[in-house]
């Protein structure tokens, strides 16, 4: 029943130099072209693909290998549906100095934004 773009307002606090992976779930479209946006500018992300969970459910990823101050900001994902751009709720990425203990805040309702996954 139409597009369902998941994502709840989230604040992520990450240590400088650490990786973070965000994800965005899109339901209700067979072939979404998922774009990531930071502070209003599209993030070019050619080596990050997205996963079909089912024919009408997709998850897009944005991987930041090593977060620096310039990466802090407001991120969201968007898709075009019938000529209109649908956008998710934003995630706010903030940084603490390298070596500090990072934590993240998460609103307690359903969200398809991942917690940061420190993989590197």
């Amino acid at each position: 029943a139409g597009l369902k773009l998941m994502g709840a307002p989230v604040k992520l606090t990450v240590s400088q130099g650490q990786p973070v992976k965000l994800n965005c779930s899109v339901e209700g479209m067979e072939e979404p072209d998922i774009q990531w946006v930071k502070d209003g500018a599209v993030v070019q992300n050619l080596d990050q693909l997205y996963i079909p969970v089912s024919e009408q459910h997709w998850i897009g990823f944005l991987s930041l290998k090593s977060v620096e101050r310039s990466d802090a900001g407001r991120y969201w994902c968007q898709v075009e549906d019938g000529g209109e751009t649908e956008i998710s709720q934003p995630v706010w990425l903030t940084l603490v100095p390298r070596g500090s203990s990072a934590h993240h805040h998460h609103h307690h309702h359903h969200s398809a934004w991942s917690h940061p996954q420190f993989e590197k």
Epitope: N45, L49, I51, K120
Partner: antibody
Framework: EVQLVQSGADVKKPGASLTISCQAS????????ISWVRQKPGKGLEWMGQ????????HYGPSFQGHVTISADRSTATAYLQWRSLEASDTAMYYC??????????????????WGPGTLVTVSS | SYELTQPPSVSVSPGQTARITCSGD??????AYWYQQKSGQAPVLVIY???KRISGIPERFSGSSSGTMATLTISGAQVEDEADYYC???????????FGGGTKLTVL
């Protein structure tokens, strides 16, 4: 089983047009992205560009922008690489590459690739 | 345009450790991928996102990255590892992909 079947070798004269193809089977074509990679004889790999299955969005390497066109026909699950005017320097092997990420039970995606066998293009007068 | 720099050749004896480097200004922020290409064959992806090994690739292949340098390490190189190896990553602006010039690994 995933397969990428590329069109056969071709010999053309400079200035001729050419389209080579890469037909996919074994998966839903629009689920994944296809890249084209050039390899001149005895030389290294060069990334030419990419087409994303959904919406057929394209991106090109700076050396190839304006010289080639990447397209796809979703109804036949085929990606294309097209030249309007070939040059001798286009002589090379051309590979199509399918990119895929999927999860195996967890939330962290695994990355896979499949390469076509390559199409040899020879441009000679 | 953005470039990734690799040594043209690396030689090791069987059983030794081979290290192939790749340098690029964007590598502190962009992941490196590594390909193996044996003579007359299509390339095969062995490492993605700096250090993740593709399923089916032997454990002797590993990847690492520090600053502007990514490294492919083959611990206990075998004769069958003789091939050309290419690094691959995203341009600084993230809008196109780039291969390194390739490194010929000789195991003799």
């Amino acid at each position: 089983e995933v397969q990428l079947v590329q069109s056969g070798a071709d010999v053309k004269k400079p200035g001729a047009s050419l389209t080579i193809s890469c037909q996919a089977s074994g998966y839903t074509f629009t689920d994944y992205w296809i890249s084209w990679v050039r390899q001149k004889p005895g030389k290294g790999l060069e990334w030419m560009g990419q087409i994303r299955g959904p919406a057929s969005a394209t991106h090109y390497g700076p050396s190839f922008q304006g010289h080639v066109t990447i397209s796809a026909d979703r109804s036949t699950a085929t990606a294309y690489l097209q030249w309007r005017s070939l040059e001798a320097s286009d002589t090379a092997m051309y590979y199509c590459v399918r990119h895929q990420q999927q999860t195996s039970g967890g939330t962290i995606p695994e990355y896979y690739q499949h390469w076509g066998p390559g199409t040899l293009v020879t441009v000679s007068s | 345009s953005y470039e990734l720099t690799q040594p043209p050749s690396v030689s090791v004896s069987p059983g030794q450790t081979a290290r192939i480097t790749c340098s690029g200004d964007a590598l502190p922020k962009k992941y490196a991928y590594w390909y193996q290409q044996k003579s007359g064959q299509a390339p095969v992806l062995v490492i993605y996102e700096d250090k993740k090994r593709i399923s089916g690739i032997p454990e002797r292949f590993s990847g690492s990255s520090s600053g502007t340098m990514a490294t492919l390490t083959i611990s206990g190189a075998q004769v069958e590892d003789e091939a050309d190896y290419y690094c691959y990553s995203t341009s600084t602006g993230g809008n196109y992909m780039v291969f390194g010039g390739g490194t010929k690994l000789t195991v003799l």
